[in-house]
Interface confidence: medium
């Protein structure tokens, strides 16, 4: 299974739902397809309520049975953990793979949780974040944001990921707009506590 | 070369047994689910089931579960399609292919020449 | 059991341009930019011609490209030669696996 970068607000934009949610056990093979279903327990939702419509919730995360079929692995024993979960939605049903944006809540940055709460949806549908993975790479339009964290960090996960959101500056130009946290957590020269 | 080579055309009774073969080179065939797809005389494609022969974890779809059996050998990296009991409406052209995997997409790749099964009393 | 529904044939004359259609619903083709056109000429084995919508492997003709509109996917094969003469399928992702395929369309070469 091969998934491509993903910036949390590309993720958010194509996603159906976005929750916040605990996962409850072991997956449950359903037989006849090529699926199988955690429990899930939602505490948040964040996108996808015009979606929903009348549902109050999702009790099940599908996914592919096996992590060669991108499905997801959920390797969390604790039960009690929240997750961010960016998923899709298919007849009435959450659904989501290896390629998910799939995360503890509290490994998000408090950037990315307040973007992922109120932010990135300002840019869903007019702005576009774009990956740079080689140099060189230029802006193909002025409603995109050159993406450069794989460039300059070596890793999807650097200034533009976890500080950053692409936004209009106006209607015709979109930039990459701080999210108003200390940036002191992803700087390349600091060391994480031990 | 990249390729997945079928055995021959076979032509047996109702009732008797067959198994047809696909073999891979020129890729890791431990790394790629193996599918099988049945094209009846005239008719569409449909997917019978795939295999991942690096563990010989196998899915059927639902119309083909328990009508045949799908099964691989990693050591000549080689596919299997068997009958146990023939029947005249298993007649078709048989396909094996190589299914890619990202995300939410699975789509074939390559493909084996075909295996035409005639079964006829 | 079919999910895709394509016409089940398509003309053009040599040099036109053609397009053939894939129509499913928001949870196969329209909820995902993950559709697959297939070639299969009278007595061979298919052959990819375009994957992820509108992707093509490589050795195949710049002639043949894919599009996707809400619920429709398209396949436009343009500067139509004798040699495109064949069925077409579209594929997409399902949960059924049964369901993947569309039935097909005969594009003729007129």
């Known amino acids: 299974c091969s998934c491509a970068p993903t910036h949390p607000q590309t993720a958010f934009c194509n996603s159906d739902l976005v929750i916040r949610a605990k996962f409850m056990g072991s997956p449950e093979i359903i037989e006849t397809t090529l699926y199988q279903r955690y429990e899930i327990k939602m505490t948040k939702m964040l996108k996808g309520f015009d979606a929903v419509g009348n549902a109050t919730g999702f009790r099940f995360a599908y996914t592919p049975a096996m992590e060669s079929l991108c499905g997801y692995v959920h390797k969390s024993q604790n039960r009690s953990e929240e997750f961010l979960i960016a998923g899709r939605l298919r007849n009435g049903n959450l659904h989501i793979t290896a390629c998910s944006f799939l995360v503890p809540w509290h490994n998000l940055s408090p950037a990315q949780q307040k973007a992922f709460v109120k932010t990135y949806s300002a840019g869903c549908g007019v702005c576009t974040v774009f990956p740079c993975s080689a140099i060189p790479c230029k802006l193909e339009s002025d409603s995109h944001c050159l993406w450069t964290d794989q460039i300059l960090m070596g890793s999807e996960k650097g200034y533009q990921s976890d500080h950053f959101a692409c936004l209009p500056r106006n209607p015709d130009l979109c930039t990459w707009q701080y999210l108003g946290v200390s940036m002191t957590r992803s700087l390349p020269l600091a060391k994480a506590e031990a | 070369q990249v390729q997945l080579v079928q055995s021959g055309a076979e032509v047996k009774k109702p009732g008797e047994s067959l198994k047809i073969s696909c073999k891979g080179s020129?890729?890791?065939?431990?790394?790629?689910?193996i599918g099988w797809v049945r094209q009846m005389p005239g008719k569409g494609l449909e997917w019978m089931g795939i295999?991942?022969?690096?563990?010989?974890?196998?899915r059927y779809s639902p119309s083909f579960q328990g009508q045949v059996t799908i099964s691989a050998d990693k050591s000549i990296s080689t596919a299997y399609l068997q009958w146990s009991s023939l029947k005249a409406s298993d007649t078709a052209m048989y396909y094996c292919?190589?299914?890619?995997?990202?995300?939410?997409?699975?789509?074939?790749?390559?493909w084996g020449q075909g295996t035409l099964v005639t079964v006829s009393s | 059991d079919i999910a895709l529904t394509q016409p089940a044939s398509v003309s053009g004359s040599p040099g036109q341009s053609i397009t053939i259609s894939c129509t499913g619903t928001?949870?196969?083709?329209?909820?995902?930019?993950?559709v697959s056109w297939y070639q299969q000429h009278p007595g061979k084995a298919p052959k990819l011609m375009i994957y992820?919508?509108?992707n093509r492997p490589s050795g195949v003709s710049n002639r043949f490209s894919g599009s996707k509109s809400g619920n429709t996917a398209s396949l436009t094969i343009s500067g139509l030669q004798a040699e495109d003469e064949a069925d077409y399928y579209c594929?997409?992702?399902?949960?059924?696996?049964?369901?993947?395929f569309g039935g097909g369309t005969k594009l003729t070469v007129l």
């Open positions: 020129g890729y890791s065939f431990t790394s790629y689910w």
């Open positions: 295999i991942y022969p690096g563990d010989s974890d196998t």
């Open positions: 992820d919508v509108s």
């Open positions: 928001s949870s196969d083709v329209g909820g995902y930019n993950y």
């Open positions: 292919a190589r299914l890619r995997v990202h995300d939410y997409a699975m789509y074939f790749d390559l």
């Open positions: 594929q997409s992702y399902d949960i059924m696996p049964e369901r993947v």
